[in-house]
């Protein structure tokens, strides 16, 4: 038994036929010693007398609000809730399994940007006697603060004969660092109480994995002279992180009829304009995704093709925006070849995802994973890799990136990747290895050797251990190169001499 909140207790029960249940001792919160009687819920039947009451809790009939009285006066209450465990598994009767992205997904969370603000939601078919309480933190062993509001009913839907209720909650990390590479996941815990049943649900994620931008805004069409083609332009959504030269998006533009089966035109671009073929009765749609990390695509923003004549023309901003004026060269060190670094780091992002594309479908955050991922270098908040830090002195950040590149380059050349099951040299991992080396050489200033971090002694003996470690390393590498690519893209746009 444990206390959920003041005067509310959860009794954990193994739930099987003829289970002995749990013996619970309730103590009346009073200085009085005698003349105390106990009742349950609205019943006037006296269950016992004395300052303590011992009960055997086996089923829901034994749970409820226990009240101690003296001479018709209520002294205190103790609400007992039951938490069922069947075959070693805690019950999940209150919430509906959303089955996306995998089975046993009860909580789903999304973030519109990297500000540390996110929304979680869940579904239930229960309409009454239902309460939720949400807690969250960054990491679990040494948790950092995340503040969550109250869960509210956000939608009601009819599903066949049933009504389905959607609840949602907004949370905000207290000291968010949008530009940093996350090393500890956000933990979300939801306590659900239905009548006398208690259940808890958890979700663990990195903000980068739950990013889903809002749709692009201000779609405009401009027909091109003497052509079937139309130039479509748009802008970054207002809710996306800034500056856009650092937090860049990529876009998919599609021309589609009302039916998905109809023919279409489709093009991908990093710019905020594209040229497509518009058809009568079709619509032009644009959606967005983080340019350097393969999280979710936004919903589509659409405009009908037929409106192309009357809509205001004007092309998009052409780039990833937010560039502003060219800034001064880097103090205290030579400036890198920003554009070359940008191109190579973007290639690294692509290679990191092609080396391990299924990463999103595998839950590798198992017990002890915080330790594993902390063995690799992370670009942290104080490393100067945020836009302001780069402007002040990019050398700190570049040194950190260089250390990380060398570290991962050594890891990819180590027994973890060279041992069984073997990888061929021109596999994506082989190309990734070579590109990491190439970028680290671009960064290393002449006659200047930065310190490099020691590789931890990770020597898995079994092929399956090696495979698991590869997944985890590539997962971390995807996050690391995404931050590096943002740094170089921003540098190329704003710091190039």
């Amino acid at each position: 038994i444990w206390e959920l909140k003041k005067d509310v207790y959860v009794v954990e029960l193994d739930w099987y036929p003829d289970a002995p249940g749990e013996m619970v001792v309730l103590t009346c919160d009073t200085p009085e010693e005698d003349g105390i009687t106990w009742t349950l819920d609205q019943s006037s039947e006296v269950l016992g007398s004395g300052k303590t009451l011992t009960i055997q809790v086996k089923e829901f009939g034994d749970a409820g609000q226990y009240t101690c009285h003296k001479g018709g006066e209520v002294l205190s209450h103790s609400l007992l809730l039951l938490h069922k465990k069947e075959d070693g598994i805690w019950s999940t009767d209150i919430l509906k399994d959303q089955k996306e992205p995998k089975n046993k997904t009860f909580l789903r969370c999304e973030a519109k940007n990297y500000s540390g603000r996110f929304t979680c939601w869940w579904l239930t078919t229960i309409s009454t006697d239902l309460t939720f309480s949400v807690k969250s933190s960054r990491g679990s062993s040494d948790p950092q603060g995340v503040t969550c509001g109250a869960a509210t009913l956000s939608a009601e839907r009819v599903r066949g004969d049933n009504k389905e209720y959607e609840y949602s909650v907004e949370c905000q990390e207290d000291s968010a660092c949008p530009a940093a590479e996350e090393s500890l996941p956000i933990e979300v815990m939801v306590d659900a109480v239905h009548k006398l049943k208690y259940e808890n649900y958890t979700s663990s994620f990195f903000i980068r994995d739950i990013i889903k931008p809002d749709p692009p805004k201000n779609l405009q069409l401009k027909p091109l002279k003497n052509s079937r083609q139309v130039e479509v332009s748009w802008e970054y959504p207002d809710t996306w992180s800034t500056p856009h030269s650092y937090f860049s998006l990529t876009f998919c533009v599609a021309v589609q009829g009302k039916s998905k089966r109809e023919k279409k035109d489709r093009v991908f671009t990093d710019k905020t304009s594209a040229t497509v073929i518009c058809r009568k009765n079709a619509s032009i749609s644009v959606r967005a995704q983080d340019r350097y990390y393969s999280s979710s695509w936004s919903e589509w923003a659409s405009v009908p093709c037929s409106g192309s004549g009357s809509s205001r023309g004007g092309s998009g901003s052409g780039g990833s925006g937010g560039g502003g004026s060219k800034l001064r060269a880097v103090p205290g060190g030579s400036s890198p070849a920003w554009t070359q670094c940008q191109q190579l780091s973007q290639k690294l992002c692509t290679l990191a995802w092609s080396a391990h594309p299924l990463v999103g479908h595998m839950d590798l955050r198992e017990e002890g994973d915080e330790e594993t991922t902390n063995d690799v270098p992370h670009i942290q908040c104080g490393d100067g890799c945020d836009p302001q830090g780069l402007r002040d002195n990019s050398q700190f950040c570049l040194q950190r990136i260089h250390q990380g590149l060398i570290f991962y380059e050594k890891l990819l050349g180590s027994d973890i990747f060279t041992g069984e099951p073997s990888l061929l040299p021109d596999s994506p991992v082989g190309q990734l290895h070579a590109s990491l080396l190439g970028l680290s050489q671009l960064l290393q200033p002449e006659g200047h050797h930065w310190e490099t971090q020691q590789i931890p002694s990770l020597s898995p003996s079994q092929p399956w251990q090696r495979l698991l470690l590869r997944f985890k390393i590539l997962r971390s590498l995807q996050a690391f190169v995404a931050v590096a690519a943002r740094v170089f893209a921003h540098g190329a746009a704003t710091l190039s001499p």
Epitope: R228, Q229, K263, D265, R266, V267, K280
Partner: antibody, heavy 118, light 107 residues
Framework: QVQLVQSGAEVKKPGASVKVSCKAS????????LHWVRQAPGQGLEWMGW????????EYAPKFQGRVTMTTDTSTSTAYMELRSLRSDDTAVYYC???????????WGQGTMVTVSS | EIVMTQSPATLSVSPGERATLSCRAS??????LHWYQQKPGQAPRLLIY???QSISGIPARFSGSGSGTEFTLTISSLQSEDFAVYYC?????????FGGGTKVEIK
């Protein structure tokens, strides 16, 4: 299944015109874009243009603009590509292809060899 | 127009070995890049679309990667039926253009 069957080989004199046909089957003709791509002997592939059979819209590669005409006959599910003012370097295999997506080529015809020789 | 350059022009590989074919665009084309296989006397066949998307019916040994200006087609373990010419094609803008092709031949 989706199939494209092209007309037979042609031999033409320089300055003449050629009209290659491409009969579609296995799908609703107006549901796919139709492209024409050619390949000179021992050479690579060269895109010529596309047509939307639903409305007759076309887009031609600048190199062929003014010399090529793409048409369709929806009643027979047939596409045509006419190339005028033929030169010896127009000697090639001409392929028609169809796709629901405009910008790449999913289903190909077997090809029609057009020889331009005096 | 966007110029597509493939390398090498010819690649000699033994059956069972891995083949890596490169394609470079003269300007950034995001992932608007498609790969085709052509055997002698046959029409080309679509293998990969949008840089890395696989086609149903195409063996899993064919995979694509890349974005921007550099792209790769990888055949993980060459089978006898894979010896052919491979073309890349950009769809970023009209006119649509192809690379010159890479001939994969038996070593």
């Amino acid at each position: 299944q989706v199939q494209l069957v092209q007309s037979g080989a042609e031999v033409k004199k320089p300055g003449a015109s050629v009209k290659v046909s491409c009969k579609a089957s296995g799908y609703t003709f107006t549901d796919y874009y139709l492209h024409w791509v050619r390949q000179a002997p021992g050479q690579g592939l060269e895109w010529m243009g596309w047509i939307d059979p639903e409305n007759g819209d076309t887009e031609y590669a600048p190199k062929f603009q003014g010399r090529v005409t793409m048409t369709t006959d929806t009643s027979t599910s047939t596409a045509y590509m006419e190339l005028r003012s033929l030169r010896s370097d127009d000697t090639a295999v001409y392929y028609c292809n169809a796709n629901k997506e405009l910008r790449y080529f999913d289903v190909w015809g077997q090809g029609t060899m057009v020889t331009v020789s005096s | 127009e966007i110029v597509m350059t493939q390398s090498p022009a010819t690649l000699s590989v033994s059956p069972g070995e891995r083949a890596t074919l490169s394609c470079r665009a003269s300007q950034s084309i995001s992932i608007n890049l498609h790969w085709y296989q052509q055997k002698p006397g046959q029409a080309p066949r679509l293998l990969i679309y949008f840089a890395s998307q696989s086609i149903s019916g195409i063996p899993a040994r064919f995979s694509g990667s890349g974005s921007g200006t550099e792209f790769t087609l990888t055949i993980s373990s060459l089978q006898s039926e894979d010896f052919a010419v491979y073309y890349c094609q950009q769809s970023n803008s009209f006119p649509l253009t192809f690379g010159g092709g890479t001939k994969v031949e038996i070593k």
